[in-house]
């Protein structure tokens, strides 16, 4: 199996994490996609997901998380706005493809959120960085409960995150043929 790697972001409270997950266009364009947190000793837990089938360029908002799937470009944009210290933790994008196990998108994201006024537009009320005008058509998608038949033999890396999430969890294994690329933070 390919070694799992992490990309680390160190941000201040109030800023926005903004990443995009690239996927193989032909295979996964309309597949449902999800943003997950990996807590210490637990299986990945879904925080937000796109609709099924995933709609093109259609924002889905769950709390402070916004997902947008751009089919034509093969990428899922994930934003976590108005970051809080307790959002710190390990995250990943996955693609649902039942009955098979979800695909994980490289790389996992290690988010470190620290207290304090950052002095950047990310912490200002007037900033476009953390004040997103979500279209009125924004939807909340229901994330499926997906249990892998396999078990995890090793606990995921330690995470300090404690995030309020929907009641859906996903077990997944290591599929790492897809690349994740950072965008604006």
């Amino acid at each position: 199996a390919t070694k799992l790697t992490e990309e680390k972001y160190e941000l201040k409270e109030g800023q926005t994490l903004d990443v995009k997950c690239d996927y193989t266009l032909e295979k996964f364009a309309s597949s449902q996609k999800a943003w997950q947190i990996i807590r210490d000793g637990e299986m990945p837990k879904t925080l937000a997901c796109t609709e099924r089938p995933s709609k093109n360029s259609h924002p889905v908002q769950v709390g402070r998380i916004i997902l947008e799937d751009y089919h034509d470009h093969g990428l899922l944009r994930v934003r976590m706005v108005n970051l809080q210290v307790e959002d710190s933790g390990l995250y990943q994008c996955v693609i649902y493809q039942p009955p098979k196990e979800p695909h994980m998108l490289f790389d996992r994201i290690r988010l470190v959120v620290t207290k304090g006024f950052s002095g950047t537009p990310g912490s200002n009320e007037n900033s476009t960085q953390n004040v997103y005008k979500i279209p009125p058509t924004t939807t909340k998608a229901l994330c499926p409960l997906y249990t892998s038949p396999r078990t995890v033999t090793q606990a995921p890396p330690k995470s300090t995150a404690d995030v309020s999430t929907p009641d859906s969890e996903i077990n997944l294994t290591n599929v790492t043929d897809i690349i994740r690329v950072p965008v604006f933070n």
Epitope: Y9, K12, D22, H73, V181, N185
Partner: antibody, heavy 125, light 107 residues
Framework: QVQLVQSGAEVKRPGSSVKVSCKAS????????ISWVRQAPGQGLEWMGG????????NYAQRFQDRVTITADESTRTAYMELSSLRSEDTAVYYC??????????????????WGQGTTVTVSS | DIQMTQSPTSLSASVGDRVTITCRAS??????LAWYQHKPGKAPKLLIY???SLQSGVPSRFSGSGSGTDFTLTISSLQPEDFATYYC?????????FGQGTKVEIK
Amino acid sequence: QVQLVQSGAEVKRPGSSVKVSCKASGGTFSIYVISWVRQAPGQGLEWMGGIIPLFGTPNYAQRFQDRVTITADESTRTAYMELSSLRSEDTAVYYCARGHGPGSSHYSYYGLDVWGQGTTVTVSS
Amino acid sequence: DIQMTQSPTSLSASVGDRVTITCRASQGISSWLAWYQHKPGKAPKLLIYAASSLQSGVPSRFSGSGSGTDFTLTISSLQPEDFATYYCQQYNSYPWTFGQGTKVEIK
């Protein structure tokens, strides 16, 4: 091979505006951050802001936020930087640069890897 | 904003010298740091990205190291074409910021 070609030199009066264009040829345009960086005479490089054409929402450095407007037109593969209320200290070379894109390494953000040739803007009365 | 402080601001060196430039971030930026070479009348050129990855086409005498707040650009054996100004730049968090530059001059 991606190339960024900028518009020509401009001479402007204080208080006026200038709009510099940056046209991409070759490669993908929509999913890259197109950044604008300037260098005033005798000064260092300064990041002004940038935009991902696909997403359309610009991000600005705080000191330029009130005066700069960055836009992009996907159909013509062109990014624009408009700076208003010009003053003499805005005299500088303005560069556009490609910010990042998909890659084959784990660190798939490549820095500002492709730059335009620069546009000299002179503000003088 | 994250402040990037380079040192020295200028240095004089001879061809063949080993040159080291440091860059310090005012807060942690993980490995999200790039180094650029800039010559008068030309566009800046990316040398190093992600703190230590060599950009395609850049000679191997250039190397980068560091993570968190302290970073280093090293030119193992200075060549005549290396005399220029060098900048570090962070892209861990918006707004991206550059160091003030280090001018490498001929001794």
